[in-house]
Structures are given as C-alpha cells and as structure tokens.
C-alpha cells in the first residue's frame, strides 16, 4: 500500500494559558524534500484549516507571521503548538501532510486530536 | 457562494493552441490545491492536471506531459490551463475542480468544451 | 498508477430498489482517500462520498460507502428517480489521481 500514514494523540488537554502541543508523524513512502503541514480543525461536517506551513527535510518549519500555530521537524515527525486558544476551541484537530516535491504526490490525513480547552477562572477580587 | 466558472473552450485545429480560464469564488482560493479534470463525449473522466497553493507546486498526466501547462494567479482567484500542441483525442469537456481540505474533489466548475477538429 | 475498476458497467434497477456499486483497487487504497460522485446528463459530476464512507454536505442518508484495502462499495437504499445517472469512484490519496470508468444506473 502506497498510501501515506498519519498518527497523532487521540487527546490532548490545552494548558490554562491556553496552549496546546502535539506530535504529528507520517510514514513516507517516498523520499521527500518538501511536505506541507496543515492543521485543520474539524466541527460537525464542517473543515478549516486553522494554519499551513511548507518546509524543506532537514530545514525549519515557518507558519506566517500571524499563524496561531508554531512548530519544528525532525525527519518524519513535526511538533505542532497551538496557541491562544479558549474554551470554544475545543476540537477535533486534524494533521494533514503533503509530499509535494519530488513526484509523486502524497496526501495524509490524521485522525484527529481532540483537543479540549478549559478557560482559567477569573481571580477574585482581593481586600486588602 | 463557493463556485468555479470555466471559459476558453472552442473549436480549434490539430497542433494549434488554447488557453482556459476559470474563474474562483466563494472561498480562500491560495489555500486549495484546483485541478483540472476532462470528460471526452461519451467517456469517463480523466485528471488532466493540479496545481498547488502558492502555485509553485504542479503535476501533470503523461498524456498531456510538456504540452499543458497549468498557473494560477491568487491575486485574481483565477487558474489557467495552456494548451498547446492539441490533438484530436484532447477534445473532451474540460472541468476546474477545487480540491477540499480532505482531499476530495469537492466543488466543480459547470466545464468548457474543447473540440480539436481539422 | 493505481487502476481502478468498476462492476457493473451498467445497472437496471426500479425506483424504490437497493442499488450496489462496486470499485476494486489494482493496488490497496487507503480508505481515507477513496470518494465516489455522481453525474447526471450534461451536468459536473458531484461529490457525494469522501474517506470511503464520510457523506459529502447535503448528500441524503440513503446513499452510503463502505469498504477498505482494494475492494470498496457504494450503497444505494432506495433508489430515488433523481438517482438515476453514472457514478464515479476516485482515489485521491497519491498522484496520479484516477478514476474508476463508471457504473450507469438505469431505469429498469
């Protein structure tokens, strides 16, 4: 089978900060020099795509500047971090992973992270 | 509302060549991969060619290999596919398909129809 | 390239009939990248299943997919007169992307 395989968490629990980091992983089938990252988030049937980044093996991963998503690679593993997450966000978390260069064309999709978010409980007003 | 429209299509001679427009809207054109997808009369469908995000990323059939040659402009939300060296066997309904965040092709345009004739 | 091969070619079948597709793989398909659409007369073809068995928004329930590996299957409960037309299987899950040559669902 030349299909390629996606793991991730089944769960990750987002900190009261409101981050949330996982391990995305993919078995290549081929020997590729560029792969693109996409994080989708998906709600009911309905799929956006929270951020992308497009690196080069061996080289760092670059969200846009304005990405909510940071993260670095290792071969065939990349560390994912969400950041600026509340509680509404609490989701189904898809890694996606493309071979795009050389051919031929891979596509991989992850089951899914659910990521759950829990906003911190406002401090109460202190007397001093 | 999410729609792709096709235009270009014609009557045009053995060898010579055609360029196909299609334009995008409804969505966030840069962040799908689009296609193009033939259908000859009568006959099944048949990918032609992709092209990815940025534009910097393309593949292509063997059948249509070093004569088409598929480009984007983001800037206009609209993908093109240039045809050259045509054949009588290109002559078919060519359709631009968006890609979905899954990978399936989830929209598609109506199609325009290429007819290469002497 | 993977081949992709469907049975029957043609299907003749009453409204209110279940309707069996089959698409057999040359090679195993991962089941997250196998969809099939459906195409009426002079029309594009339309998304109706995703991942083997996800159903595509506004695809009524009586469509369904199943299957895994090589051999795939979409269901049909009970054929409606607006079910009629050609479907289509697809993997997408590595270049090139192919089609499988179509099933023709008839009115009997």
């Known amino acids: 089978c030349k299909a390629m395989h996606v793991a991730q968490p089944a769960v990750v629990l987002a900190s009261s900060r409101g981050i949330a980091s996982f391990v995305c992983e993919y078995a290549s089938p081929g020997k590729a020099t560029e792969v693109r990252v996409t994080v989708l988030r998906q709600a009911d049937s309905q799929v956006t795509e929270v951020c992308a980044a497009t690196y080069m093996m061996g080289n760092e991963l670059t969200f846009l500047d304005d990405s909510i998503c940071t993260g670095t690679s290792s071969g065939n593993q990349v560390n994912l971090t969400i950041q600026g997450l509340r509680a509404m966000d609490t989701g189904l978390y898809i890694c996606k992973v493309e071979l795009m260069y050389p051919p031929p064309y891979y596509l991989g999709i992850g089951n899914g992270t659910q990521i759950y978010v829990i906003d911190p409980e406002p401090c109460p007003d202190s007397d001093f | 509302q999410v729609q792709l429209v096709e235009s270009g299509g014609g009557v045009v001679q053995p060898g010579r060549s055609l360029r196909l427009s299609c334009a995008a809207s409804g969505f966030t054109f840069n962040s799908y991969g689009v296609h193009w997808v033939r259908q000859a009369p009568g006959k099944g469908l048949e990918w032609v060619a992709v092209i990815w995000y940025e534009g910097s990323n393309k593949f292509y059939a063997d059948s249509v290999k070093g004569r088409f040659t598929i480009s984007r402009d983001n800037s206009k939300n609209t993908l093109f596919l240039q045809m050259n060296s045509l054949r009588a066997e290109d002559t078919a309904v060519y359709y631009c398909?968006?890609?979905?965040?899954?990978?399936?092709?989830?929209?598609w345009g109506q199609g325009t129809m290429v007819t290469v004739s002497s | 390239e993977i081949v992709l091969t469907q049975s029957p070619g043609t299907l003749s079948l009453s409204p209110g009939e279940r309707a069996t597709l089959s698409c057999r793989a040359s090679q195993s398909v991962s089941s997250s990248y196998l969809a099939w659409y459906q195409q009426k007369p002079g029309q594009a073809p339309r998304l109706l299943i995703y991942g083997a068995s996800s159903r595509a928004t506004g695809i009524p329930d009586r469509f369904s997919g199943s299957g895994s590996g090589t051999d795939f299957t979409l269901t049909i409960s009970r054929l409606e007169p607006e079910d009629f037309a050609v479907y289509y299987c697809q993997q997408y899950g590595s270049s090139p992307w192919t089609f499988g040559q179509g099933t023709k669902v008839e009115i009997k």
């Open positions: 398909v968006r890609a979905g965040y899954l990978g399936a092709f989830d929209i």
